[in-house]
Structure formats: C-alpha cells, structure tokens
Interface confidence: low
C-alpha cells in the first residue's frame, strides 16, 4: 500500500549522512517506471534539504543531525509519478518524529531567589517557590523532568537542615522548628535542579530566605526597681525614665513598648508614655502630688509590646518608689473668689468683710495680707486679720471701675516660709444701689421758634437703679413757668418743654427740676435759644445778633 507509518528519528544522530530512513513504494511500479519525490518543510521549503528521497528507489534520506528542541516533528508529502510525469498515487503524508536526547541542562529562572518566612513557624510552612526549566522532553522521557534539591544552607544554625524543597514543584518549606530571627535573620540556600528526575545534569542557584520578626521576645525592664524624688504640686513633671530591652527588631511593633501602671496610683496622679525613639517609658505626674496628704507612692508598671505576643511570655513589671518632696506651698484663699454685697456710699472705715487664706503646709505659718489691685483705691485690708474696710467712696455709678454693679479687687496672702510664697484671692464687691442721683434731662440746649413753636422733647436719665428711677416728676422753678410749660411722658421717660408766651429772639435759662420715684430732686438749667420764626427751627435765621 501507498502508506508510511510515522518514522521516529533520534536527535543529534552521528550519521553517516545521508542516512536511509524508510522506503517509499508504490505497487504501480509493476506497470510502469515510477519516480519518487518529497515536498514540505524540511524538504523543498525551509529548513530545506534536511530530508531527500532517492528518485528511483524511493529511499527517504536524512541529510544532517536533527535538533528536537528546534523542530520536534516534520510533516512531509511523498509523491509518485510515471515516466511521463503523470501522478500515479495521491500525495502521501509522511510524519517524522524527532525523539529526544538529554542534551540540555536545567536552567533556573533566576540566579538568586528571595523569600521570607516568620520566625518560629511550624515545620511544613511554605516559604517560596523556585523554578528551573529544561528544554528537553519531559512528557515522553525523563530528560526534561527536573528534580529540585537543597545542596547547602548558610549559616548552619541551629542546624543544617532547616528547610526542604519539594523535588517536583520547587516549593521551599520549613522542615525544622527553631527559626529565630534574633539568632539568624537570613539564610542562603544553594539549590540544585537535576534533570532525568534527579539522575542527570545539575545546575545551581541561590535562594535567600529572610526570617521575619515575630513578637517572640517580651520587653524586660532593666533595671526593675527605681526610686524617684518629685516636688509636690508639680504637674507634668518627669518622675522617671523606665528602660526595657527587647530582642525583637528595633522600631518594629514587636519591639515598641507599651507601658501600663497596674498598681499604686489610686488617685490617678501619674501617667506613662513611650518615648518614640528610645522606647523608654516616661513616667510623669498627671496631677500635683500632695506631701501633706501622702509623702510616698509605690507604683507598679507593666510593659508589653504594640504587637501581641505570638506565644505565652511572662510580663515584666517594674517597681517605682516615688518620694514626694515638701515645698513651701502658697497660702490659698478660701474661697478663691469671694462675693460680698455692700451698699455704695457707706462711710470710710466701715467693715466690708474678713477674707483669709489657709496655708497647706503642716507648720503653723504666719500669714499677712495686703491689697494687690484696687483700681479706685476704695478699700483697705488689715495685714494680720484679713479684715477689709472702706477707704474711699464706693460709687456704683462710676463706670471706670464698676462693671455690672461689681467692683473687683485682688488681694494677696504671704506666708513666712523660706522662701516666702504668695497666694491671691479675688474679692467681688456687689454694690447695692442707693438713690444718690437725681434725674437729668438731655439735651440741655434747645432752639425754638417764638411763633407757633414746636414742643421740645427731652430724654430723662437717672444713673440709679429701679426703684430709684421712674416715674419722674417735672417742675419749672424760678419763674420759668411764666413762659414755659413742662410735662412728663411716663411711657418713654421724656419731658416735653413748650413755650407758652411770645418771647423775643434771645437766649433764655429755663430752670427745670426733675425728681425720681424716691423723690431725689435734680435742678437742671436748660439753655433755650428763641428765634424769630414759625414752627420748626434748627438754628435762628440770619440776621441774628445774639445777646
């Protein structure tokens, strides 16, 4: 039959060439002379001339060694023609399969592989995968089947078999417990890839395994006991710097310390913070300490890390004995701010109140008093007793010194300690109003026409407080009532001044007496300019020669 089974040819053949492979044979050669030819890649198209055929015998020839890694299979067509060139057979498929020889070594995809794994992980934990390739055939032969192995490990601590590599996949895993970053932070593995599934050619690469830090070391106080001296009353005062050592990676969460006061601070007097660079615990006072109440505090401070421990570790505790140092404390006025009601205008020398201070110190210190700030100079203070008396006229209506009826004075208490200390107190005098001001009209100068005059409306003001104000009463005195009339409008606290009779153009004094609800009377002279005009006027029309 005009058929050829697939032909297998090993690559890298030694020859001699041309080498006979197989004979093409048509059974039509009984009737006529047959000529054979081949076509296809490897014969008459690139790569040309690898194969040929003996024209008359049909022998298929190989002209040169084959390379499977270049071309693994050739597909040719065989042709048979008679002497006159006519086809005697259909083109026949010729498959030439190049069989593999182990002519390539494995190649790692990198010279150096990097991977990382946490310290302390259990055996079996995967670290990384390395890959080697081999151009040889790994499907029909073992020539391209790569087996991985670890050749050596540096350093060899805690022993030389810390890792294993899966012979087929190249996955590197931890095989032994004892990975400790604090002892060995990095391993260099020399890895091998061998073809023939481990029995052939070998190539080498490096795998660097970084051991990542886990929080497997607790911070430890060094030293564990501290003694400190702190002056009483100091807030934000640095009491002590606590030092810890931690074998984990510096500046990592497994190394950074977290401090906690676990005992001895019932009054919440202390606070502790971590210094960002030194990792020390900075113990400071949150509130002032009181020597007189408690002269020694014993604190217990625990230290952990920002990151949780990966295994159960003992917690280190430090003991800090804080000795509170006595300082001469300032006297404290009781209360710090004292409100006293006092009537304005009371006589000089009259007592206002007694305002004293207590000294927190245990010794019975002598306290003397004086006025520190008395804007109007209205008060005096007895240096021994703290009695405050009137030294000037208390005037509720004096807006330079009094705000909202309150006159504010600062007083000083000085002890006889060494050195002396001073405390201040604030005395707030609420001045009770007395009817010491009569009503006053505004404005006190008016201009009015002498014909059909407009009434003049004057506002009434009284510096006193109710009930020493409205309702007001008005009265014209000293014959002013002959020409003028005054009426109080109670609704808006005004007085309406009207011209009753004709007056020639001139300036006149109108004597207006106003009294308040408490009958406090105030006489005011209104200067009235009368003009020759009708109705409303702002200013007398020219010509005008004033008298």
């Amino acid at each position: 039959d005009w058929v050829v089974a697939p032909i297998s040819v090993p690559e890298n053949g030694k020859g001699p060439f041309p080498q006979r492979l197989n004979q093409l044979k048509s059974n039509k050669d009984r009737d006529t002379k047959i000529f054979y030819s081949i076509t296809g890649p490897g014969a008459d198209s690139p790569p040309e001339g690898v194969f040929a055929v003996e024209k008359e015998t049909g022998w298929l020839l190989l002209n040169k060694p084959l390379d499977r890694e270049e071309i693994a299979k050739y597909e040719l067509f065989g042709h048979a023609v008679s002497e006159n060139g006519a086809s005697v057979e259909d083109p026949m498929n010729i498959s030439i399969i190049v069989t593999d020889q182990n002519d390539h070594k494995p190649k790692f995809t990198q010279d150096t592989f990097r991977g990382s794994v946490l310290e302390g992980v259990l055996p079996g934990t995967s670290v990384m995968q390395v890959t080697a390739t081999d151009e040889d055939d790994a499907i029909h032969t073992y020539n391209g089947v790569v087996a991985y192995s670890i050749h050596s490990q540096e350093p060899k601590d805690p022993h030389d078999l810390m890792f294993t590599i899966h012979r087929s996949t190249g996955t590197i895993s931890v095989i032994s417990s004892g990975l400790d970053r604090e002892k060995v932070p990095e391993y260099t593995l020399t890895i091998q890839a061998t073809d023939m599934d481990g029995d052939g050619s070998t190539t080498t690469a490096v795998a660097v395994v970084e051991i990542l830090d886990a929080n497997d070391n607790a911070p430890v106080f060094d030293p564990q006991k501290y003694e400190s001296h702190v002056p009483e009353n100091a807030v934000g005062h640095e009491v002590q710097r606590l030092t810890v050592t931690d074998l984990d990676a510096p500046n990592s969460p497994a190394w950074r310390a977290t401090y906690l006061i676990v005992g001895g601070d019932d009054g919440d007097h202390f606070t502790i913070a971590t210094h960002p660079e030194s990792n020390q615990g900075i113990l400071t006072t949150r509130k002032g300490l009181d020597f007189e109440a408690k002269n020694q505090h014993t604190l217990y401070v625990e230290v952990t890390n920002e990151a949780p421990f990966v295994l159960k570790l003992p917690t280190s505790t430090a003991t800090i004995v804080v000795h509170v140092e006595d300082v001469n404390e300032a006297p404290v006025f009781v209360p710090p701010s004292k409100v006293v009601e006092v009537q304005e205008g009371i006589p000089t020398g009259e007592a206002v109140c007694v305002y004293t201070a207590k000294d927190p110190d245990k010794e019975n210190q002598k306290i003397s008093y004086r006025i520190l700030r008395d804007p109007a100079g209205w008060l005096a203070m007895d240096p021994d007793s703290g009695q405050v008396t009137v030294a000037g006229t208390l005037d509720r209506e004096d807006e330079r010194f009094v705000r909202n009826n309150i006159y504010e004075v600062m007083v000083l208490a000085v002890d006889n300690g060494s050195p002396p200390t001073t405390g201040t107190g604030t005395l707030l005098l609420t001045l009770i109003d007395v009817n010491d001001h009569g009503p006053v009209p505004e404005p006190r100068e008016i201009t009015i026409c002498n014909q059909s005059p407009e009434s003049q409306v004057l506002n009434i003001t009284d510096k006193d407080l109710s009930p020493h104000t409205s309702p007001f009463q008005a009265q014209l005195t000293d014959d002013s009532d002959i020409y003028w009339m005054a009426e109080v409008n109670e609704k808006d606290d005004t007085v309406v001044l009207s011209l009753k009779k004709f007056l020639k153009q001139d300036t006149y004094d109108v004597h207006l007496s106003l009294s308040d609800h408490g009958n406090k009377e105030q006489l005011t002279v209104i200067r009235a300019t009368v003009c020759d005009c009708h109705g409303h006027v702002e200013k007398c029309p020219d010509p005008w020669k004033g008298g």
Epitope: Q110, D111, T112, R114, G115, S116, E154, P155, D157, D180, R181, E182, K183, V184, P185, E186, T188, V206, V208, E210, D213, A249, P250, N251, S252
Partner: antibody
Framework: EVQLLESGGGLVQPGGSLRLSCAVS????????INWVRQAPGKGLEWVSV???????NYASSVKGRFTISRDNSKNTLYLQMNSLRAEDTAVYYC?????????????????WGQGTLVTVSS | DIVMTQSPDSLAVSVGERVTINCKSS????????????LAWYQQKPGQPPKLLIY???TRESGVPDRFSGSGSGTDFTLTISSLQAEDVAVYYC?????????FGQGTKLEIK
C-alpha cells in the same frame, strides 16, 4: 557619636595567621550586623564577612573556611581571625556597621566605617 | 555571584556641571515582595573609608547634600550629581545587597576638568 576603630594589621608570611580587632563606640555592638570589607592596594572594595545580631555569620567564598568573624559584646569589640593567609589577602581591612538590623532599614547598606587596618601577606 | 559593572571607569567634569555614573547588575535587584531595589552608592575620597550616599537605590542617607541623587530599577542604576563641587572628587562605588555575597562595582573615578 558612632565610631569604629580597627587594629591588628601588619606583615605576615603566606600560610600565617592574624587577628584583626574592631572596637566600636556610640552604639551597642550586638544591636547591629557588622561587616568586614577589604580593599587591595589601588583596587576596589570586596565584602568579606558579616556577623548578625544573633551571632549568625556569612562569608565570601574566597575566605570561607579560613576566616572566622566573632565578637565580644562585653568589650564592644568585633574580631576577624584570619588563617592560612595568601598573598591575595593583602588589603586594607575595614569594619563597617550595617544601617539597621532589619530588611526595611536597608541593612545591607553600611553607614559607618572605620579608618581601616593594612594587612600585608608576603614572604 | 551577582556581578556589578560601573561605567565609565573614570571621568573629568567641570565644577557646576551635571555628573552621571551608571551601574549595571547581572541580575535584577528588585525584590517583588517589597518593590525595593537592593542597591547602595558610596563615595571614597583618597586615604579615607567609603561613605554611604544612597540606599534602596534612591534614598539619600541623612547628611548627604541634595545634589546627590540615585535612580533606576531592576538591573540599571544611576548616581547623579546635579552640580559638581570641588569636594566631590572621589571614587564612587555601587553595591548590591540583594544576596550573598554582597558585591561592589569596580568603581568610577571622578576628577575636576
């Protein structure tokens, strides 16, 4: 202030031994990886060895098995024991501190170096 | 071992001019896990030990003037001096710390023209 000071260099015959020292101050020796780097006369730099914070070590293949790196934490001193010395070991030897202990510190970069000590191997 | 190759071996540049020194590694120094390049640059003046200028290929060490900068990734790296000063005359080395053994370039000698 961080300082490293090498000593112990000198003239030695091929096959002989020498111990170099590196006294450090301004930091705790055991807190950082420390390297030895050498420089042959008129030539470039060659890394020799490192000792890790936990005591683990690595060596260049040219010195492996002949040189040993160690340290004495109490004396804050690093050592390089050099045995079976060869002419090609002639160089100025520097000790150099790694930038940090951890990969993210760039620990393979060396931020402080000593002034170096000259080792001459010659017959 | 990873081979580091610097170019040029030497160069002469006028004061105030820009300087670039190249460094090529035989394999990539970029670690995919952290996207960092494990490369440092050093300056060595005559009779002195080397001084660290740059690490992580582009991070300037504290105290190093900002005219020094590093760039590049993978296998190709550059040290640039933006405006050369007289005191910059030295030999410059690149160093990989991707894997052991650490290796240095052969050095580039920089002189004033």
């Amino acid at each position: 202030e961080v300082q490293l000071l090498e000593s112990g260099g000198g003239l030695v015959q091929p096959g002989g031994s020498l111990r170099l020292s590196c006294a450090v101050s301004g930091f705790t020796l055991s807190s950082y990886p420390i390297n030895w780097v050498r420089q042959a006369p008129g030539k470039g730099l060659e890394w020799v060895s490192v000792i890790w914070t936990g005591g683990g070590t690595n060596y260049a293949s040219s010195v492996k098995g002949r040189f040993t790196i160690s340290r004495d934490n109490s004396k804050n001193t690093l050592y390089l024991q050099m045995n079976s010395l060869r002419a090609e070991d002639t160089a100025v030897y520097y000790c150099a501190k790694s930038r940090g202990v951890y990969d993210f510190d760039g620990r393979g970069a060396m931020d402080y170096w000593g002034q170096g000590t000259l080792v001459t191997v010659s017959s | 071992d990873i081979v580091m190759t610097q170019s040029p071996d030497s160069l002469a540049v006028s004061v105030g001019e820009r300087v670039t020194i190249n460094c090529k590694s035989s394999q990539s120094l970029l670690y995919s896990s952290n996207q960092k390049n494990y490369l440092a640059w050093y300056q060595q003046k005559p009779g002195q030990p080397p001084k660290l200028l740059i690490y992580w290929a582009s991070t300037r060490e504290s105290g190093v003037p900002d005219r020094f900068s590093g760039s590049g990734s993978g296998t190709d790296f550059t040290l640039t001096i933006s405006s050369l000063q007289a005191e910059d005359v030295a030999v410059y080395y690149c160093q990989q710390y991707y894997s052991y053994p650490y290796t240095f370039g052969q050095g580039t000698k920089l002189e004033i023209k």
